[in-house]
Interface confidence: medium
Amino acid sequence: CRTSECCFQDPPYSDADSGSASGPRDLSCYRISSAGYECSWQYEGPTAGVSHFLRCCLSSGRCCYFATGSATRLQFSDQAGVSVLHTVTLWVESWARNRTEKSPEVTLQLYKSVKYKPPLGDIKVSKLAGQLRMEWETPDNQVGAEVQFRHRTPSSSWKLGDCGPQDDDTESCLCPLEMNVAQEFQLRRRRLGSQGSSWSKWSSPVCVPPENPPQPQVRFSVEQLGRDGRRRLTLKEQPTQLELPEGCQGPAPGVEVTYQLQLHMLSCPCKAKATRTLPLEKMPYLSGAAYNVAVISSNRFGPGPNQTWHIPADTHTEPVALNISVGTNGTTMYWPARAQSTTYCIEWQPVGQEGSLATCNLTAPQDPDPAGMATYSWSRESGAMGQEKCYHITIFASAHPKKLTLWSTVLSTYHFGGNASAAGTPHHVSVKNHSLDSVSVDWAPSLLSTCPGVLKEYVVRCRDEDSNQVSEHPVQPTETQVTLSDLRAGVAYTVQVRADTAWLRGAWSQPQRFSIKVQVSD
């Protein structure tokens, strides 16, 4: 027999099938050109000394064989003696060590048996009603296919599934989606309605993450606020890596879990952008503001559960950095300016109302004035900080106000609003005899004392009504009592107390008259 033809003689070996588990399998035959055909198969077991024979029986009952030697693939033309228009039955017999192993038979019409391609190129993966949906472009000129998938997890072997018949320029498959483990999928196709035809090769792996990305287990720490008004956020613990199936352990696109850091700056709500999302690797510098930080884990199906932390504001206050002058037209704040063209955010909030939203104003980008100061002014009518109460003021600065991570704290301080000189006037001034020539003056704390750093000192004034002599006594802001000495008995005095801030003299309290009684000796 000629090697290019199917030989219509008995094969050169005994044809008893040994029935062993090894041997030829997965025979598939298909047309590879208008007149060319190919059969290929797998051989399970030791290959040394194995000879393969492709057997073919025609519908007439005549049978022939091709001897392929050790090759497990054979190409032949439609002039090799095998009818391509009529149904034929093909199988492989492998002869080794005086025994023959036989593959399962394939019955088909060769002219209709097209070698289908697996899904090629980009396989789109999405989630649909709790299932996995894969979609791909039908390979050219191969519309009309049956499709199968197989899938495995890191701990399971392959399981086979059916995608059903496909009949369009795009094909799709619904597959099971695992909640908490990654999966590897492969797809294969064969011509629709041709049970005898062969399956394509398996596609490249499609790596699919679990429906729920793993909860990110991370910890943060935040450094002290530096002199530049910024503090570094650092990651203490990296998130754990997802376990992957075997075919997804290289660079497998689609299965990755990405972790992102979502920063929400709670302070200064009037600025352009309050939230910024960053890759977890890029740990940012923060201002001294309060932040909420979330770590969001997401995969190709979208975001999963997140972990949120609150980073409190840095409460360190600058005692004298802010200067406030109150005039007839309104109020102006001055502070040491940052670089040219800096935008400032001035935020204030009544002390004790930290839960409520702070008021804030964004300045236009400004340059330092000749004294190197930045300013912010407002009119009396605006009502800003107009109530007579203590306000916490924080000023933030940024040369790039739309970039959340480029804000820094300029200063954090307290200010007493409204008519502070009147509101701060000490009340309940009382005078008690202390000795023959001294008295003790007490008063209730000024409202200014509720405002950290605002009350510079108390001043107690004593006037001798006879001589009109006046003496003033400075008192520490933490004290509400002073002893006046060297007083003369029988003389009328008036005493007043005022509370001063760094930039404002307070109003005197109502005059309190007293005298030390003359002691009459017996």
């Epitope: 208008s34 007149a35 002039q79 228009l85 209709k112 009309g144 011509r191 629709l192 309605g193 041709s194």
Partner: antibody
């Protein structure tokens, strides 16, 4: 450019014979199955016969079996249809067609030749 | 033999209309089905093979779909040059058989 040109048609009496030819050019003739397809006046298309590349396999529609013979000469790039015992119902335009993409898909056709069987 | 039927046998439509022709096989032929166009006095021309694959050089307004026994041929926007008779043809088994044709003309 693929070209198929039929010839040999004409008027013939019932019971008579005729030999149609199809000259092929622009492709490797010996690599393709070839077919004859006919079309009765005002009617649809009917596949008549086809032949394998080397002429070793030939298939016919039942209505012409035993009367018509398909053959080819690869050296001359020619396809033939020998028609014997012609009947009135064989009157048609006969087209030669290449089965190019695969068997049963006629991707190129000749312009046809008219066979009229009439007394 | 496998019988092929087509409907409608003829239709008139306006330029720009969507035209649909159906073809039915007497038994399951998978997607072994082709569509041809034949203009008056001319040889047929292959448009679609394997039920839905567009032959090279054929305008994309022509499309085909279906599998098994029911098939559809569509012209998405009828043009004057599309006046012709359209035939379906099966090649699942010998003898290869054609549908009776659908004649398409312009209103």
């Amino acid at each position: 450019e693929v070209q198929l040109v039929e010839s040999g048609g004409g008027l013939v009496q019932p019971g008579g014979s005729l030999r149609l030819s199809c000259a092929a050019s622009g492709f490797t003739f010996s690599s393709y199955w070839m077919s004859w397809v006919r079309q009765a006046p005002g009617k649809g298309l009917e596949w008549v016969a086809n032949i394998k590349q080397d002429g070793s396999e030939k298939y016919y529609v039942d209505s012409v079996k035993g009367r018509f013979t398909i053959s080819r000469d690869n050296a001359k790039n020619s396809l033939y249809l020998q028609m014997n015992s012609l009947r009135a119902e064989d009157t048609a335009v006969y087209y030669c067609a290449r089965e190019g993409l695969q068997l049963g898909i006629f991707d190129y056709w000749g312009q046809g030749t008219l066979v009229t069987v009439s007394s | 033999d496998i019988q092929m039927t087509q409907s409608p046998s003829s239709l008139s439509a306006s330029v720009g209309d969507r035209v649909t022709i159906t073809c039915q096989a007497s038994q399951d032929i998978s997607n072994y089905l082709n569509w041809y166009q034949q203009k008056p006095g001319k040889a047929p021309k292959l448009l679609i093979y394997d039920a839905s694959n567009l032959e090279t050089g054929v305008p994309s307004r022509f499309s085909g779909s279906g599998s098994g026994t029911d098939f559809t041929f569509t012209i998405s926007s009828l043009q004057p040059e599309d006046i012709a008779t359209y035939y379906c043809q099966q090649y699942d088994n010998l003898p290869f058989t054609f549908g009776p044709g659908t004649k398409v003309d312009i209103k």
